[in-house]
Interface confidence: medium
Amino acid sequence: SAPGEDEECGRVRDFVAKLANNTHQHVFDDLRGSVSLSWVGDSTGVILVLTTFHVPLVIMTFGQSKLYRSEDYGKNFKDITDLINNTFIRTEFGMAIGPENSGKVVLTAEVSGGSRGGRIFRSSDFAKNFVQTDLPFHPLTQMMYSPQNSDYLLALSTENGLWVSKNFGGKWEEIHKAVCLAKWGSDNTIFFTTYANGSCKADLGALELWRTSDLGKSFKTIGVKIYSFGLGGRFLFASVMADKDTTRRIHVSTDQGDTWSMAQLPSVGQEQFYSILAANDDMVFMHVDEPGDTGFGTIFTSDDRGIVYSKSLDRHLYTTTGGETDFTNVTSLRGVYITSVLSEDNSIQTMITFDQGGRWTHLRKPENSECDATAKNKNECSLHIHASYSISQKLNVPMAPLSEPNAVGIVIAHGSVGDAISVMVPDVYISDDGGYSWTKMLEGPHYYTILDSGGIIVAIEHSSRPINVIKFSTDEGQCWQTYTFTRDPIYFTGLASEPGARSMNISIWGFTESFLTSQWVSYTIDFKDILERNCEEKDYTIWLAHSTDPEDYEDGCILGYKEQFLRLRKSSVCQNGRDYVVTKQPSICLCSLEDFLCDFGYYRPENDSKCVEQPELKGHDLEFCLYGREEHLTTNGYRKIPGDKCQGGVNPVREVKDLKKKCTSNFLSPEKQNSKSN
């Protein structure tokens, strides 16, 4: 029988009445155009909704926008358009919400052609009040908040000026001209690239990388011949043009650009690209595009300095055309990532790693599913997940895979079961153990979201017809109840719940269409009465993550340690609550060769855990350029995997000697760096 329809499914008592009492409808007095929704702060219940409507006139486009505010998680909305003087807001800039719980909001207004600069509306009290500010420039990008201080903003102008505000947009100063890209780093540092000659495009590969640590009082050139740069974790990356040809290489710095090392990665040509797929303070996943328009490349994982890289996955799908990759960090379990590969026959297959890119495997076939037409052997196949690439190809996939850090082990995704991703209508699958095992959860495509840290999963069928039914599960997707939230079906456009999956409220957005008009409408459902009581100790059970063989001493060991979690029992219908904190008990593992990656000059032959010397380097001194100095490496070929906490066990020896010789890549050495002050 289909999931949720077997006898074992216990029904939640009186849920219709409970949900009916907690369903709130709001009809927006708007013609249907576009709608955008932003949450302001964490656990504040404040939502801002911006509706915009364009009327194309003969000579120009007439635009109208409205701003609404809720402070009860979307149950009621108040029209606050008058707070922004009924001004038309530019949706391409969205609503710039401040970091953490700063309560700051910046809206960028549309201004008439001849004006000297743009206009913004600023709020620092969770959108209760707004201040209008006229800008001395026309913004090209959304205002960017400093992660450390929400009063510091930066923006690029349409004339490529870099503008900074130190008082939350009240006063602006142009700190540099001819800027292509600017990003906040740590400690209120700004990194940016500049062009010298014509433009960003013309100077690509000849840009300079600059840094200011005092909001534009003084500057330091930290890189030349730059193609582009990126920040990931504690790493600063720059792709740099080679001296002799049109190839470029990645350089990496861990000290804000004071010193650089050349990453041990392949160089790329004009048509290729590098991409930081994921980064944390320990390591980085880097995609290196293959030559030619292949649509794939190679994933490499770094060491703790971002310098030495190990090949992680071949034929990694990353289209050059649309720039789509399926690479997904499964946030509900440490070390787990999912992505797609393009196989030799051009079919797309899903791969998963449980150890941060050390090994990749296919996803296990769900117990309750048959292999589809793509499978050569009807008894042996895998689950393949639909993600960004499928969505970009307009397949019937309404949502990317979903996981939440506080809903431990849960992953929800659309997929098909066979030898490769199928273009047929997908079903929804769930894993409750971080991707090791999967079950078909819902037939056909759905929108889905996680509430109450996994205590409730909500889903709505993806349909071209109007809908009025929502499905919910209190047992991690095993059994489903359906609730009719309105008599009059609506054209569904999206599900909205507060980021972080701690809320028990869900908003269903859509529009109603009548003979003459269509209007935006939202239904907010509060599930608090479904989960009547707070969870107690007896509602939780101990779960060992990454457990594959309980009889193995090393069972559950990933990156040198194992973790036991307290997980809500599937049979418990209770509230984790907004203050729920994941309870975990870590335990260190013994070191084995699996806890080490191969050092510079070494590689792992396939299906072998030992690192062996690269033939071309055999017998040579291992000397390499690090931080602008020549280093001599004495190694038996191993370096601990970043973030690995193992102790005892195998302990390969490693030593690096400074040869006290200067060396530079073609990039720059500290002597070449210059500083200047404004």
Epitope: P550, E551, D552, Y553, S587, I588, G648
Partner: antibody
């Protein structure tokens, strides 16, 4: 109950090898490390190494490297320690000991269950 | 290798006495220290692991303390069955090393 039963006493000549067995019962053999520790007459305890029965990986003390081999047979839940090129100062009681399994952060290699010991005498 | 030095190497005490044995590591071993009791002709028995955690089944009169390089085993009230040799053991780094032992005799 959990116990480790070792093979009987051995008398060997210098230069020979000895293989001591240790049969585990009352717990899952592969889920715990097995250490080997020896004690010369009237002396203290000396750690020789461990074997991880689940994968067969080993870690030996430098002093015994090249002379000791630790193996296991999971089908009969038995660990073995073989010491070659015996000398008279290898005369000792040899113990196998189960490694305590950490319940939280790494707690080091405690040994919570010990075999009764096997006396090995090396004499010409 | 990390050297473990136990003191005293032997001591005489009476039933009911409070007994303290110390163990010093040649370098810091955090709290990765275990204590064992061994009676003549018998295998050692784990008393304390991770410097201060009491192994299940061991009487509460035994306690351990310390971290870094200096550790202590205390028997709050010596019982007749406690006369034995006590060993400390570090398990921070390979190779595992034991102290020389402390023999507790009847006064």
């Amino acid at each position: 109950q959990v116990q480790l039963v070792q093979s009987g006493a051995e008398v060997k000549k210098p230069g020979a090898s000895v293989k001591v067995s240790c049969k585990a019962s009352g717990y899952t053999f592969t889920a715990y490390l097995m250490h080997w520790v020896r004690q010369a007459p009237g002396q203290g305890l000396e750690w020789m190494g461990w074997i991880n029965p689940s994968g067969g990986s080993t870690s030996y003390a430098q002093k015994f490297q090249g002379r000791v081999t630790m193996t296991r047979d999971t089908s009969i839940s038995t660990a073995y320690m073989e010491l070659s090129r015996l000398r008279s100062d290898d005369t000792a009681v040899y113990y196998c000991a189960r490694g305590k399994r950490s319940s939280g952060w790494y707690e080091g290699y405690g040994m919570d269950v010990w075999g009764q010991g096997t006396t090995v005498t090396v004499s010409s | 290798d990390i050297q473990m030095t136990q003191s005293p190497s032997s001591l005489s005490a009476s039933v009911g006495d409070r007994v303290t044995i110390t163990c010093r590591a040649s370098q810091s071993i955090s709290s990765y220290l275990n204590w064992y009791q061994q009676k003549p002709g018998k295998a050692p028995k784990l008393l304390i692991y991770a410097a201060s955690s009491l192994q299940s089944g061991v009487p509460s009169r035994f306690s351990g303390s310390g971290s870094g390089t200096d550790f202590t085993l205390t028997i709050s009230s010596l019982q007749p069955e406690d006369f034995a040799t006590y060993y400390c053991q570090q398990s921070d780094v390979s190779p595992i090393t034991f102290g020389g032992g402390t023999k507790v005799e009847i006064k």
